[in-house]
């Protein structure tokens, strides 16, 4: 029986140029985490294996860095990074947990566009 | 050099049994899960069966669980196929092959050839 | 089970010709996708994983593109030692399955 669960950092935001951490945790199990696989939509981004240590797609690899922990970083944000992401920890004996995280990229954030338009 | 190197196959009648082995050099054995992959003459390439790096977890193909059971001593680098109650359809080359991240096969072994036949 | 559907069978090319086979997957999956190579009486060899990441040493002129259940292997200009037969194959879930191959023969 699964008794896990995932708890992600859940719809996040983050300007666009920059950096975003995504971070999912595993509780209420003691099944033995063997791989935690990072996904965009339907793209492999990043697999971290108990074993072999982290491998990152090559198509990210200028973009995507591992950690901290099982968690990713997403660096040099664009516009086209908003959407979902899913990190699917791969468990013994419980099986595959998934956690979604829903990031949207923003042109600017919101104290720059409003301090722009301040009046004196 | 990563090597695979398969053993054990030969000729075997209806019903019985053979054992297959993979020694493994080059890499370190106990991090990488392991498969075997079969091939029957002239066909395409059929997946039989799959262990994780420390053995705890197996899956097989529905056409051989219960027949064919796989195994792995990290201490010796070796990967092995119990192949019992063999029938005419297991024919093949069987490959063993290393399944880096259980996402893709990177290297497969030169493959041994099984024949099962009266 | 997954089932992989390859196309065509098998193809007639010359060297030189850009080579596109396709691989069909019953259900999405994801990027999970594989390009292997066999030559006659050798072992399989790795081209493509994950969808579109080129493995190491395998020439540039292989690619891989696709997501969810339509995957494409292009071989942009066909090399004499090309010649083989290729097969897709998903790790989405167990069982592992193949597609049937296609065999690029020389025109």
């Known amino acids: 029986m699964m008794t896990g669960t995932i708890e992600t950092t859940g719809n996040i935001s983050a300007e666009k140029g920059g950096s975003i951490i995504l971070q999912c945790h595993l509780s209420s199990t003691t099944a033995q985490v063997t791989q935690v696989n990072w996904e965009q939509q339907d793209q492999l981004l990043a697999i971290c294996n108990a074993d072999l240590g982290w491998h990152i797609s090559p198509s990210f690899k200028d973009r995507v860095a591992p950690g901290p922990g099982l968690g990713l970083t997403l660096q040099s944000l664009t516009v086209n990074d908003t959407g979902e992401y899913f990190c699917i920890y791969h468990t013994y004996p419980d099986g595959t947990y998934t956690g979604r995280i829903f990031l949207e990229v923003l042109e600017s954030s919101v104290a720059e566009h409003g301090a722009r338009f301040q009046i004196p | 050099e990563v090597q695979l190197l398969e053993s054990g196959g030969g000729l075997v009648q209806p019903g019985g049994s053979l054992r297959l082995s993979c020694a493994a050099s080059?890499?370190?054995?106990?991090?990488?899960?392991m498969h075997w992959v079969r091939q029957a003459p002239g066909k395409g390439l059929e997946w039989v069966s799959g262990?994780?790096?420390?053995?705890?977890?197996?899956s097989y193909a529905d056409s051989v669980k219960g027949r064919f059971t796989i195994s792995r001593d990290n201490s010796k680098n070796t990967l092995y196929l119990q192949m019992n109650s063999l029938r005419a359809e297991d024919t093949a080359v069987y490959y063993c092959?290393?399944?880096?991240?259980?996402?893709?096969?990177?290297?497969w072994g030169q493959g041994t050839l099984v024949t099962v036949s009266s | 089970d997954i089932q992989m559907t390859q196309s065509p069978s098998s193809l007639s090319a010359s060297v030189g010709d850009r080579v596109t086979i396709t691989c069909r997957a019953s259900?999405?999956?994801?990027?999970?996708l594989n390009w292997y190579q066999q030559k006659p009486g050798k072992a399989p060899k790795l081209l493509i994983y994950?969808?579109?990441s080129l493995q190491s040493g395998v020439p540039s002129r292989f690619s891989g593109s696709g997501s969810g259940t339509d995957f494409t292997l292009t071989i942009s200009s066909l090399q004499p030692e090309d010649f083989a037969t290729y097969y897709c194959?998903?790790?989405?879930?167990?069982?592992?399955?193949f597609g049937g191959g296609t065999k690029v023969e020389i025109k």
């Open positions: 080059g890499f370190t054995f106990s991090s990488y899960a």
């Open positions: 092959a290393r399944v880096p991240y259980s996402a893709w096969i990177d290297y």
């Open positions: 259900q999405s999956i994801s990027s999970y």
């Open positions: 262990i994780s790096s420390n053995g705890g977890s197996t």
């Open positions: 194959q998903q790790s989405y879930s167990t069982p592992l399955t």
């Open positions: 994950a969808a579109s």
